[in-house]
Interface confidence: low
C-alpha cells in the first residue's frame, strides 16, 4: 500500500521536512502533490510527468518545494503555515489513480525565557513569592529548577497558570536558592538565567562567645555576639541594663570584680524590624591569695601519731588539690581527705611520709600552689648494726667497733661489755687486746625525742686458735640449670685466709664457680647434677688452721626423658606384657601410664597378662618431678600378633 512518512514529524520553523514515499507502484505515468487531505486542483503544489521528466508548479507552490524522481517531496525553510496534511496523487500507466496522505507539525524555536518576581525581598515566615516564567508561549511546557534540582515536594510550593507560575508560601531562609525556569516544546528546550531569592530573616536569638562566664580580676573581657540575620544584624551591648556601645564585639581591658554582672547583646534587623536579645552572667573573681599549709603536729612520731595538713585560707566554693613528692596523691588507706579536700590526714605516719607536700587552690583553668612543706617524722632507733662483722680476733691487735642505728633525731649510743657500761660514744676502741677481752659486746641506741631504745649484742672471741668453721648456704635444694648456690664460710675472722675443697680436691677452674668476699663466699652458677658433691671450707692464719665438716649439695634435677624397657615392640598373642619405665630424677619422679591416650595406673611398672591383638597401640610413660616442677614423657608402639603368624616375635615375659 502506498504510504507517506514525514521526516521529521515535528519540524522547527526555518528547518526542512522530507515527505518520504513508500511502496510507490511500478509503471507510472506521473504524480502530483497537494496541500490538504484530498486532491484539489486549487491546492496543487507540484506535478511531475515521468515520460517528459517535466515538473509543473501548482497554485500552492511556494518555491521552497523540491520533488524527487521517487515522488518524495522536500520542503525547505519551514514556516508555521506549513503545518498540516499533504496528499500524493499517483497516476499509473493504465491511468488508474492512487492516493496517500501524510502530515507534519511545525513548532517555533523557543526564545530564552526569563523569570519575573512579585517580591524581591520577602520576609521569612510572613511573605509569599510568585515567580513567573516569561514569555508566555503557546504549546510550550514549563518546568522549574531549584539549585539545578527538580522541585521538591512541599505544601509550601504551588504551580499554577499551566506551570508557568511558581508560588512559595511563607518563605523561609532555606528558600534562599537559585531558581530557573525552562520552556519546552517538541523541537526545543531553553532555560532561563538563575534568579537568587533573597529572603529577609532574623535576627535569631544571638549567641555570645566565648561561652566562658568566669574571669579573674586583671584579665581582659572580650565578648563577641552573633545572630543569624539577613541583612546582617546591627548589635548593641548593655551591662546591667545600661547601654554601652553599638558594636558586634565588647572589649573591656583589665576587668575587676565590679565588672561582674549581666551582659546583654541585642541584635536588630532594620529590614524585618525585629530585635532579639541574649543575656550572659559574667562573674569576675578576685585573685585568690597564695595558699599555705598548716600542720597540727610538727614532730609526729612514726607508727604512733597522725598528722592533719590543712590548706589555708578557707574559701567557699573552692576546689582544693594536693600533691606529695610532686605527684598527685597516691591511693592509700593511710591518706584521708576531708569532704572539701581542704584537710589531708596522714594516719600513723612513717619515715617515708616526709614529703614535700603542696596544696593548691583551683581557680578556673589555673591552679595556685602553696610553698612545699616537709614533715619532720620522728622515728627509730632501728636495731643497731655493729661493724665490722668479725667475731674472732687474735691477741695483740686493736679492736675498733662502730655502731649505727637509723633514727630521727640521730640516736645517742652506749657500749656495754658483759653487761657493764663502758662509754657513751658511737665507736668503741680497745688497743692491744688479749683473751680477757673476749665477751658480749652490746651497743645501745637511744632516741631522746621518742624515748625508744634498741640494743644489739655481738660475741667477740680473742684467741690465737681459730675455731672450726662451718658452711652456710643460701639454697639447700637448688634446681638444675636454673638456680645458683652461694656457700659462705663462717665465722668472719680478721686477718684470716679462706680455702675451699670439693670432694677432697682443690676447686676446679670453671666459669660457673666464683669466689668473693675475700674467698669467704663460693658461688656456683646454674648448678648441675654433677655439682652434687662434698664441699669443705677451711680457715687459717699465721698460727692456726681449721676445716669445716663437709656439706653435700642436694641438686634437684629431671625428670630426664624416660626409657621404657624391654625395648621390644612386637609381641605374640598370649604373652605377658611387662613394661618398666625409668627416668633420671632427683627426687625420684612420679610415674603414670597411658594406653592409646587413656590414663592407666600410677606405677613405674605396667603389667598386662595374656595380651591379645586388642592390646595393640601406643603406650606412653609420663614422669613428673614435684620439686623441680618439670614433666617428661615417652611413647612406645606395641604390636601384638596372633600366635605363629610372624616369626621372630618375642614371647613376652
Amino acid at each position: 500500500k502506498l504510504t507517506i512518512e514525514s521526516t521529521p514529524f515535528n519540524v522547527a520553523e526555518g528547518k526542512e521536512v522530507l515527505l518520504l514515499v513508500h511502496n510507490l507502484p511500478q509503471h507510472l505515468f506521473g504524480y502530483s502533490w497537494y496541500k490538504g487531505e484530498r486532491v484539489d486542483g486549487n491546492r496543487q503544489i507540484i506535478g511531475y510527468v515521468i515520460g517528459t521528466q517535466q515538473a509543473t508548479p501548482g497554485p500552492a507552490y511556494s518555491g521552497r518545494e523540491i520533488i524527487y524522481p521517487n515522488a518524495s517531496l522536500l520542503i525547505q525553510n519551514i514556516i508555521q503555515n506549513d503545518t498540516g496534511f499533504y496528499t500524493l496523487h499517483v497516476i499509473k500507466s493504465d491511468l488508474v489513480n492512487e492516493e496517500a496522505t501524510g502530515q507534519f507539525r511545525v513548532y517555533p524555536e523557543l526564545p530564552k525565557p526569563s523569570i519575573s518576581s512579585n517580591n524581591s525581598k520577602p520576609v521569612e515566615d510572613k511573605d509569599a513569592v510568585a515567580f513567573t516564567c516569561e514569555p508566555e508561549t503557546q504549546d510550550a511546557t514549563y518546568l522549574w529548577w531549584v539549585n539545578n534540582q527538580s522541585l521538591p515536594v512541599s505544601p509550601r510550593l504551588q504551580l499554577s497558570n499551566g506551570n508557568r507560575t511558581l508560588t512559595l508560601f511563607n518563605v523561609t531562609r532555606n528558600d534562599t536558592a537559585s531558581y530557573k525556569c525552562e520552556t519546552q516544546n517538541p523541537v526545543s528546550a531553553r532555560r532561563s538565567d538563575s534568579v537568587i531569592l533573597n529572603v529577609l530573616y532574623g535576627p535569631d536569638a544571638p549567641t555570645i562567645s566565648p561561652l566562658n562566664t568566669s574571669y579573674r580580676s586583671g584579665e581582659n573581657l572580650n565578648l563577641s555576639c552573633h545572630a543569624a540575620s539577613n541583612p546582617p544584624a546591627q548589635y548593641s551591648w548593655f551591662v546591667n541594663g545600661t547601654f554601652q556601645q553599638s558594636t558586634q564585639e565588647l572589649f573591656i581591658p583589665n576587668i575587676t570584680v565590679n565588672n561582674s554582672g549581666s551582659y546583654t547583646c541585642q541584635a536588630h534587623n532594620s529590614d524585618t524590624g525585629l530585635n532579639r536579645t541574649t543575656v550572659t552572667t559574667i562573674t569576675v573573681y578576685a585573685e585568690p591569695p597564695k595558699p599555705f599549709i598548716t600542720s597540727n603536729n610538727s614532730n609526729p612520731v612514726e607508727d604512733e601519731d597522725a598528722v592533719a595538713l590543712t590548706c589555708e585560707p578557707e574559701i567557699q566554693n573552692t576546689t582544693y588539690l594536693w600533691w606529695v613528692n610532686n605527684q598527685s596523691l597516691p591511693v592509700s588507706p593511710r591518706l584521708q581527705l576531708s569532704n572539701d579536700n581542704r584537710t589531708l590526714t596522714l594516719l600513723s605516719v612513717t619515715r617515708n611520709d616526709v614529703g614535700p607536700y603542696e596544696c593548691g587552690i583551683q581557680n578556673e583553668l589555673s591552679v595556685d600552689h602553696s610553698d612545699p612543706v616537709i614533715l619532720n617524722v620522728l622515728y627509730g632507733p632501728d636495731d643497731p648494726t655493729i661493724s665490722p662483722s668479725y667475731t674472732y680476733y687474735r691477741p695483740g691487735v686493736n679492736l675498733s667497733l662502730s655502731c649505727h642505728a637509723a633514727s630521727n633525731p640521730p640516736a645517742q649510743y652506749s657500749w656495754l661489755i658483759d653487761g657493764n657500761i663502758q662509754q657513751h660514744t658511737q665507736e668503741l676502741f680497745i688497743s692491744n687486746i688479749t683473751e680477757k677481752n673476749s665477751g658480749l659486746y652490746t651497743c645501745q641506741a637511744n632516741n631522746s625525742a621518742s624515748g625508744h631504745s634498741r640494743t644489739t649484742v655481738k660475741t667477740i672471741t680473742v684467741s690465737a686458735e681459730l675455731p672450726k668453721p662451718s658452711i652456710s648456704s643460701n639454697n639447700s635444694k637448688p634446681v638444675e640449670d636454673k638456680d645458683a648456690v652461694a656457700f659462705t664460710c663462717e665465722p668472719e675472722a680478721q686477718n684470716t685466709t679462706y680455702l675451699w675443697w670439693v670432694n677432697g680436691q682443690s676447686l676446679p677452674v670453671s666459669p660457673r664457680l666464683q669466689l668473693s668476699n675475700g674467698n669467704r663466699t663460693l658461688t656456683l652458677f646454674n648448678v648441675t647434677r654433677n655439682d652434687a658433691r662434698a664441699y669443705v671450707c677451711g680457715i687459717q692464719n699465721s698460727v692456726s688452721a681449721n676445716r669445716s665438716d663437709p656439706v653435700t649439695l642436694d641438686v634437684l634435677y629431671g625428670p630426664d626423658t624416660p626409657i621404657i624397657s624391654p625395648p621390644d615392640s612386637s609381641y605374640l598373642s598370649g604373652a605377658n606384657l611387662n613394661l618398666s619405665c625409668h627416668s633420671a630424677s632427683n627426687p625420684s619422679p612420679q610415674y603414670s601410664w597411658r594406653i592409646n591416650g587413656i590414663p592407666q595406673q600410677h606405677t613405674q611398672v605396667l603389667f598386662i597378662a595374656k595380651i591379645t591383638p586388642n592390646n595393640n597401640g601406643t603406650y606412653a610413660c609420663f614422669v613428673s618431678n614435684l620439686a623441680t616442677g618439670r614433666n617428661n614423657s615417652i611413647v612406645k608402639s606395641i604390636t601384638v600378633s596372633a600366635s605363629g603368624t610372624s616369626p621372630g616375635l618375642s614371647a613376652g615375659a
Partner: antibody
C-alpha cells in the same frame, strides 16, 4: 575523688520517654556546669545539653530542643535528663560530664561510665 | 555551627614512633577554647589537652597540642602501647559545642 554514676538507660519505643540520672560526688557540685554528651554506635561524639552550676541556665543542641529537658537537684548532687518524643536517631550511649573550671562551659575533665539508650519498635 | 574536620581518619603507627593528628575548624576558634580527648573502646573519653596546648592533670608530656585560628594539631612524641585509641578534638568557644569525628591511632 570525683565520681559520676549514671542510671536509667534502656530500650524504649519511638515516641516514648525515658529519664537518665547522674549522681555526682567528690567535688563542690554547685560550682560546676554539667553536660550530657552522646555517642551513637560507631559514630562521633555529639554534645546534647548543658546546665549551669545553679541550674538557672540550660542549653540544648538543635536536634533535641523542645524534646529533652536537663535539670539538676543540688540538694541531692544529681542531674536528670528527661527525654520525650524519642526517635530512632536518639539511640546512643549517653555520658554525663563535669566541666573543668568554675562556671566554665563545655570543657570536660570527668565523665560518667555511660548508659545505653535504644529507641526501637 | 562550627564544624571540626579531623584527619586522617585512621593513622597506622609503630610503638615508639611519632604521631601527628590534625583538626581543622570551619571558622576561626579562639585557641583558648580547643580541647583534645582520648577514647578507648568501651570507655568514656579522657581529657588530654585544653586551651589548644595545656596538658590536663596527669597527662604525660609526650602529648602536646598546638595551633590557632582554624588549624590545630595533637602530637604524640613517642607512642606507648596504651596510646592506641581514638582521639577527638572539640571546640567550646560557641554553642553548640562540637566534636570532630575522631582519628583512630592503630598499631602498624
Amino acid at each position: 575523688q570525683v565520681q559520676l554514676v549514671q542510671s536509667g538507660g534502656g530500650l524504649v519505643q519511638p515516641g516514648g520517654s525515658l529519664r537518665l540520672s547522674c549522681a555526682a560526688s567528690g567535688f563542690t557540685f554547685t560550682s560546676y556546669a554539667m553536660s550530657w554528651v552522646r555517642q551513637a554506635p560507631g559514630k562521633c561524639l555529639e554534645w546534647v545539653s548543658a546546665i549551669s552550676g545553679t541550674g538557672d541556665s540550660t542549653f540544648y543542641a538543635d536536634s533535641v530542643k523542645g524534646r529533652f529537658t536537663f535539670s539538676r537537684d543540688n540538694s541531692k548532687n544529681t542531674l536528670y535528663l528527661q527525654m520525650n518524643s524519642l526517635r530512632a536517631e536518639d539511640t546512643a550511649v549517653y555520658y554525663c560530664a563535669k566541666d573543668l573550671g568554675w562556671l566554665q562551659y563545655g570543657l570536660f575533665d570527668y565523665w560518667g561510665q555511660g548508659t545505653l539508650v535504644t529507641v526501637s519498635s | 555551627d562550627i564544624q571540626l574536620t579531623q584527619s586522617p581518619a585512621t593513622l597506622s603507627v609503630s610503638p615508639g614512633e611519632r604521631a601527628t593528628l590534625s583538626c581543622r575548624a570551619s571558622q576561626s576558634v579562639s585557641s583558648s577554647y580547643l580541647a583534645w580527648y582520648q577514647q578507648k573502646p568501651g570507655q568514656a573519653p579522657r581529657l588530654l589537652i585544653y586551651g589548644a596546648s595545656s596538658r590536663a592533670t596527669g597527662i604525660p608530656d609526650r602529648f602536646s597540642g598546638s595551633g590557632s585560628g582554624t588549624d590545630f594539631t595533637l602530637t604524640i612524641s613517642r607512642l606507648e602501647p596504651e596510646d592506641f585509641a581514638v582521639y577527638y578534638c572539640q571546640q567550646y568557644n560557641n554553642w553548640p559545642l562540637t566534636f570532630g569525628c575522631g582519628t583512630k591511632v592503630e598499631i602498624k
